[in-house]
């Protein structure tokens, strides 16, 4: 006799892992033999998909590799003609091992900022993500939490964060591990110890120290006057992420000496700066300080205008005498190149006569001033208009140091030959005659303040620097 | 770090020629004088030749005038000198040293290691 | 021609002090010739310990003091150390016609 379908064995919900087998089993009693049909999520299942396997006249339906996205309702649908259609439904749950679906990467944060790395994970049932940093679990804290998402979130991310990470996805199924990241955290240059400003007498040599620190450890470059250095010698040392530089100066004029530190985060660089100053203290001048000694010069810029193995004094007051002495020397012969002609010879031999002078030689050695005629002939005769263009200078501040203060004698303090002539040197290179002063260049309107002495005469019937010549 | 580093030398037969180099770093190379100074085997220091800090002036032993020739490259930091004539005599290690000043004698503060030169048939 | 002489070696007990000198073959050592001396070790370069008649280079311990006795110049070293074992020279800057500067032929000197 025809009978209606009757399910006998309802679906039940069933549970699979990915790529493993589930079957769903759809036992019917009827006659004649219904036809079975399958759904899933009300969708038919085509007889013909081979990831299906329908058997036992369309009873049992496997799929044969779990794919996650097979989850849903499952529907078995029995008709035969007699009576109506029956229906049963079940729940595949695919079941999963956790699965890393974005993983963490390598991070580059600046300090204090706020660090994310990422990790977002699939699993059933769904994975709880915990973090590991070198080989401990990860506490979190108020700074360091683990979002919902299962990325690891830290505000204000400080030095000590910096290190290896990788986070760990774990179900009742199994574990799974993502692969180690490195957190690098980066520190803006800071100075530690900025260099300290001095008050040092002139010819000194002073020792700028700066540190500064940062990751990557930070460079340092000064700066002297709001321009590179261009003179000292610079000496560095790395330890400990903190960079040590001394910048070693032979102190001839005042300045602002900037310490700066830079370090690059990626296309951006970071600087911290310091700035210390360096100011000439009052000194005495060579003729009111007889702390010296007498040596043969030996340098380069006076070499044509001191006599070949002229003694000269050399002032204890600096602290390296020669080179001082020799870089002032130096420094005002460059002022000189603009100078005229005539000025020049002139000046140059009142400059090396004057910061090179002539040391007698004793139990106390003592410098022997220029006599003041052979000054006033360079001031008020070689050297009238260039003399009131430095004074103008000197008095309006255009130079750049003291040291021309320091290189051009006044003329009315130095003794005169007329004196004691052994009490003061002679410039054996200003050798002329009245006649001379005939070619020589209008004087100034002020009359000499003394009067410029009958030198003696020569052969020579113009103005001379050569060292053969003497005045004696 | 004051640093000197010597180079070129070598063996030479006599009336060879060499050119040593010195490459300075560590210091501000053109505010300084420099000077080589030599030993051979076994014996004292002999200075050889010495420049101030911008060239120009140049000195030598007397032994050394017209066969040998300093010079500098303030832009390479690099100190030379040109050998020219050699004699067994000259058979020594070269020092490069770095005056403590501007002047072309002021004391040697800073020695190089070396280079050697043989002179020898 | 200059020639600088010293004592060709010289021998002091550790602790104790010794003076080397660095004299001329015609006339007196004075500040003129910037008397410097300088340390040499067997294999290594020379290292500077005085300038100038007096002034110590930088990072050289004060045992170490340069001056003029009489018509030469003197190396003094004071409380003498084992390490202080080595060759000394003394440079002299020199003036007869044209500049120049003249090494001693050295010290050796042995602490017992």
């Known amino acids: 006799l025809p009978k209606a379908p009757v399910i006998t064995t309802p679906l039940e919900t069933v549970d699979a892992l990915v790529e493993e087998v589930a079957t769903f089993m759809c036992a019917v009693e009827s006659y004649p033999q219904p036809e079975i049909s399958w759904t899933r999520n009300k969708i038919l299942i085509k007889l013909f998909d081979t990831r299906y396997s329908i058997r036992e006249n369309g009873q049992l339906l496997t799929i044969l590799s779990v794919e996650d996205s097979d989850d849903g309702i499952y529907c078995c649908t029995a008709n035969n003609g007699v009576g109506g259609a029956v229906e049963s439904c079940g729940a595949l749950q695919v079941k999963m091992k956790p699965k890393i679906t974005r993983p963490p990467i390598n991070v580059k944060i600046i300090e204090g900022l706020k660090a994310v790395l990422p990790c977002t994970t699939m699993g059933n049932p769904k994975p709880s993500v915990s973090w590991i940093k070198g080989d401990s679990p990860l506490r979190e804290n108020s700074r360091i939490a683990v979002l919902e998402s299962g990325s690891l979130r830290i505000h204000n991310v400080q030095k000590e964060d910096a290190g290896q990470y990788r986070c760990v996805a774990k179900n009742s199924l199994g574990t799974a591990y993502s692969k180690v990241v490195k957190l690098e955290v980066e520190v803006f240059a800071r100075i530690l110890r900025a260099p300290e400003s001095h008050n040092v007498t002139f010819g000194s040599f002073v020792t700028l120290h700066c540190t500064a620190t940062g990751i990557p450890v930070p460079t340092i470059t000064w700066i002297e006057n709001g321009n590179a250095v261009s003179s000292g010698s610079i000496q560095e040392s790395v330890k400990d992420r903190v960079i040590d530089s001394r910048l070693q100066l032979f102190i001839t004029k005042p300045g602002l000496y900037t310490c700066i530190a830079t370090n690059k985060h990626g296309e951006k660089f970071s600087t911290a700066k310091a700035a210390a100053t360096i100011s000439i203290a009052e000194w005495s001048k060579p003729q009111k300080d007889n702390k010296g000694y007498c040596a043969q010069y030996r340098g380069e810029v006076c070499n044509a205008v001191l006599a070949k193995d002229a003694l000269v004094f050399l002032n204890t007051s600096y602290a390296d005498p020669e080179e001082a002495q020799e870089l002032l020397v130096h420094t005002a012969w460059n002022e000189l190149k603009v100078v005229s002609p005539v000025c020049r010879p002139a000046a140059e031999a009142l400059l090396c006569n004057h910061i090179f002078q002539e040391c007698s030689p004793g139990v106390v050695p003592t410098p022997i001033p220029i006599c003041r005629e052979y000054c006033l002939a360079v001031k008020e005769l070689f050297c009238a208009k260039e003399w009131l263009v430095m004074e103008e200078k000197t008095h309006r501040g255009l130079y750049r140091s003291e040291m021309h203060l320091l290189s051009v004698p006044e003329c009315s303090k130095l003794p005169s030959m007329h004196w004691d002539p052994t009490a003061c040197a002679r410039l054996p290179h200003l050798d002329y005659n009245k006649e001379n002063l005939k070619t020589f260049p209008p004087m100034t309107s002020s009359k000499p303040s003394v009067d410029i002495p009958n030198l003696p005469s020569s052969s020579s019937s113009s103005f001379s620097v050569s060292p053969t010549y003497s005045m004696t | 770090e004051v640093q000197l580093l010597e180079s070129g030398g070598g063996l030479v037969q006599p009336g060879g020629s060499l050119r040593l180099s010195c490459a300075a770093s560590?210091?501000?190379?053109?505010?300084?004088?420099m000077s080589w100074v030599r030993q051979a085997p076994g014996k004292g220091l002999e200075w050889v030749s010495a420049?101030?800090?911008?060239?120009?002036?140049?000195y030598y032993k007397e032994s050394v005038k017209g066969r040998f020739t300093i010079s500098r490259d303030n832009s390479k930091n690099t100190l030379y000198l040109q050998m020219n004539s050699l004699r067994a005599e000259d058979t020594a290690v070269y020092y490069c040293a770095k005056r403590s000043g501007r002047i072309a004698f002021g004391a040697l503060d800073a020695w190089g290691q070396g280079t050697l030169v043989t002179v020898s048939s | 021609q200059t020639v600088v002489t010293q004592e060709p070696s010289f021998s002091v007990s550790p602790g104790g002090t010794v003076t080397l000198t660095c004299g001329l073959s015609?006339?007196?050592?004075?500040?003129?010739?910037?008397p410097d001396w300088y340390q040499q070790t067997p294999g290594q370069a020379p290292r500077t310990l005085i300038y100038?008649?007096?002034s110590r280079h930088s990072g050289v311990p004060d045992r170490f003091s340069g001056s003029i006795l009489g018509n030469k110049a003197a190396l003094t070293i004071t409380g003498a150390q084992a390490d202080d074992e080595s060759d000394y020279y003394c440079g002299l800057y020199s003036y007869s016609g044209s500049k120049n500067y003249v090494f001693g032929g050295g010290t050796k000197l042995t602490v017992l």
């Open positions: 420049i101030p800090w911008q060239g120009g002036s140049t």
């Open positions: 015609s006339g007196s050592v004075t500040s003129s010739n910037y």
């Open positions: 560590g210091f501000t190379f053109s505010d300084y004088g």
């Open positions: 100038s008649t007096d």
